[in-house]
């Protein structure tokens, strides 16, 4: 821990009425937990790469920024950060890479100022629906969370429960409508195959949404209409084939949006015509000149912005009798 334990403070005769003396000023006990480093002025506690198996009980009340990364926490129980007096100023909590596989209901209760939470790089096989809302009420007290970072929280295939991982995550995001104030949500690198239909409509304050490096094939059933504050939408490195008219119109209607679409396997056939037309006109797509076709083979690496309607054909579907094996 960081605070010094030695003590000495000389009191010289620089003051005319003060005799020269040595003051063995005893310092106050260090309030920094074992295996952690603390800065009172930065109001920061770092317990990093220490193989901790539980959250330290003796966290100082002044902490605003808490780093508990690179540990072996395994389970975050209810009230994991509940203290007396409470950690009333804790605003940013980073638990990334701490081998968490279970986050229980109410794990983040009694943190009235918690604005940023990072659970990235933990194999979350069991994320309680009430991890962020704290209660199973249909409408919970609003969470103070503004940023929720959940990148690479997908557990290995053999450790997943017998349920949809996407569904588990979304249940936690929507429970009790507690996250109505959430502005940044990062869900990158989670093998998401789809985005459940309701999720975005119930997060109306979102400014930044990162869904990059997933396996999203389509956005057909996803509505962006309510996200009037959305500023950035990261969809790079997914499995998107085409964006259809409804999605294009919704994105175009968002006043502040920037969309990132790099490294998707775009299928450049007749269904792509509307998207190509839109790309040529829109300002919302960042790096749109880098988007290239992946299929069909004859179109591979062609730049979407350089295509015209004649390039975008669909092979006729042959009647079964004419198909060859």
């Amino acid at each position: 821990s960081s605070s010094p334990t030695s003590s000495a403070s000389s009191f010289s005769s620089s003051a005319p009425f003060l005799a020269s003396a040595v003051s063995a000023q005893p310092p106050l006990p260090d309030q920094c937990p074992a295996l952690c480093e603390c800065s009172e002025a930065a109001r920061t506690v770092k317990c990093v790469n220490r193989n901790l198996t539980e959250v330290p009980t003796d966290l100082p009340a002044y902490v605003r920024n808490l780093f508990l990364t690179g540990n072996q926490l395994a389970v975050l129980p209810a009230g994991a950060f509940a203290r007396r007096p409470p950690l009333a100023e804790l605003a940013a909590l980073n638990l990334s890479g701490s081998r968490l596989d279970e986050v229980r209901a109410g794990a983040f209760e009694h943190l009235p100022s918690l604005r940023q939470l990072d659970l990235s790089h933990n194999p979350l096989a069991d994320l309680s629906p009430f991890a962020f809302s704290g209660s199973n009420a249909s409408v919970s007290a609003p969470s103070p969370l503004v940023e929720l970072i959940l990148n690479h929280i997908v557990p290995p295939e053999d450790e997943r429960q017998n349920r949809s991982f996407e569904g588990m995550v979304v249940a936690a995001l929507l429970a009790g409508r507690a996250l109505q104030g959430l502005r940044r949500l990062e869900l990158a690198s989670n093998h998401f195959l789809y985005l459940p239909r309701d999720v975005l409509a119930q997060l109306p304050s979102l400014r930044h949404l990162d869904l990059s490096n997933n396996s999203l094939v389509s956005l057909t059933y996803v509505s962006f209409r309510n996200l009037t504050h959305l500023e950035s939408l990261h969809l790079e490195d997914n499995a998107l084939k085409v964006l259809h008219n409804g999605t294009l119109a919704e994105l175009q209607g968002l006043p502040h949006i920037r969309v990132f679409l790099d490294n998707n396997p775009w299928v450049c056939d007749c269904h792509m015509a509307d998207m190509v037309t839109w790309l040529k006109e829109t300002e919302v797509v960042q790096g749109k000149d880098r988007l290239t076709c992946a299929y069909p083979e004859k179109m591979r690496n062609r730049v979407l912005l350089e295509l015209n309607s004649a390039d975008l054909d669909c092979d006729p579907i042959l009647p079964p009798s004419l198909q060859t094996s």
Epitope: P4, S9, L28, E40, A41, R43, A61, P85
Partner: antibody, heavy 119, light 108 residues
Framework: EVQLQQSGPVLVKPGASVKMSCEAS????????MSWVKQSRGRSLEWIGV????????IYNQKFKGKATLTVDKSSSTAYMELSSLTSEDSGVYSC????????????WGQGTSVAVSS | ENVLTQSPAIMSASPGEKVTMTCRAT???????FHWYQQKSGASPKVWIY???NLASGVPARFSGSGSGTSFSLTISSVEAEDVATYFC?????????FGGGTKLEIK
């Protein structure tokens, strides 16, 4: 060994200004708040203000706003206090003191700089 | 600001005697943010009792602190000659930090 070494005593005329220093050693300077405290002869202690060397934030006691100006030089782990428009009321011993916000108590004091204001 | 009033201003005790000095605040103070300092003549203050009742390292066990809310006290169970000093209370309930006027302890 934590030490707060302050500059020497000064005798100044009314209306003048004075800048005193407090060099910290034996700990990480930017990790702790630095306060300044006044003690007049035969009088109690008065808290002047506090400087957060990490963020640059300064909080003054309202009574000393416009009288005291706190600064730091992080590169030399030194805190400074300038007193302006001095009067006899400003005479006293001024100490830098490390404030522990774990407790909001002072754990180390400088030896004090005596300021005498006299015409 | 939260004004601290110490009493008595000066007290005199014989060696071995038990003494108690008090500090009253104009508004409530958290027990974790109330402290006592000892200042001997010609020296800087030393934190003596922190968070109402905890002795700083090196402080003899004859000292104790107690109190809550707006009323706090420092007690010496058996005064010794080396205890001659002025004792200041200090609180934080939001800035500014404030100190009491001090209690000067003398030995008869």
């Amino acid at each position: 060994e934590v030490q707060l070494q302050q500059s020497g005593p000064v005798l100044v005329k009314p209306g003048a200004s004075v800048k005193m220093s407090c060099e910290a050693s034996g700990y990480s300077f930017i990790d702790y708040y630095m306060s300044w405290v006044k003690q007049s002869r035969g009088r109690s202690l008065e808290w002047i203000g506090v400087f957060n060397p990490y963020s640059g934030e300064i909080i003054y006691n309202q009574k000393f706003k416009g009288k005291a100006t706190l600064t730091v030089d992080k590169s030399s782990s030194t805190a400074y206090m300038e007193l302006s428009s001095l009067t006899s009321e400003d005479s006293g011993v001024y100490s830098c003191a490390r404030l522990r916000i774990s407790y909001y108590a002072i754990d180390y004091w400088g030896q004090g700089t005596s300021v005498a204001v006299s015409s | 600001e939260n004004v601290l009033t110490q009493s008595p201003a000066i007290m005199s005790a014989s060696p071995g005697e038990k003494v108690t000095m008090t500090c009253r605040a104009t508004s409530s103070v958290s027990s974790g943010h109330f402290h006592w300092y000892q200042q001997k003549s010609g020296a800087s203050p030393k934190v003596w009792i922190y968070s109402t009742s905890n002795l700083a390292s090196g402080v003899p066990a004859r000292f104790s602190g107690s109190g809550s809310g707006t009323s706090f006290s420092l007690t010496i169970s058996s005064v010794e000659a080396e205890d001659v000093a002025t004792y200041f209370c200090q609180q934080y309930s939001g800035y500014p930090l404030t100190f009491g006027g001090g209690t000067k302890l003398e030995i008869k």
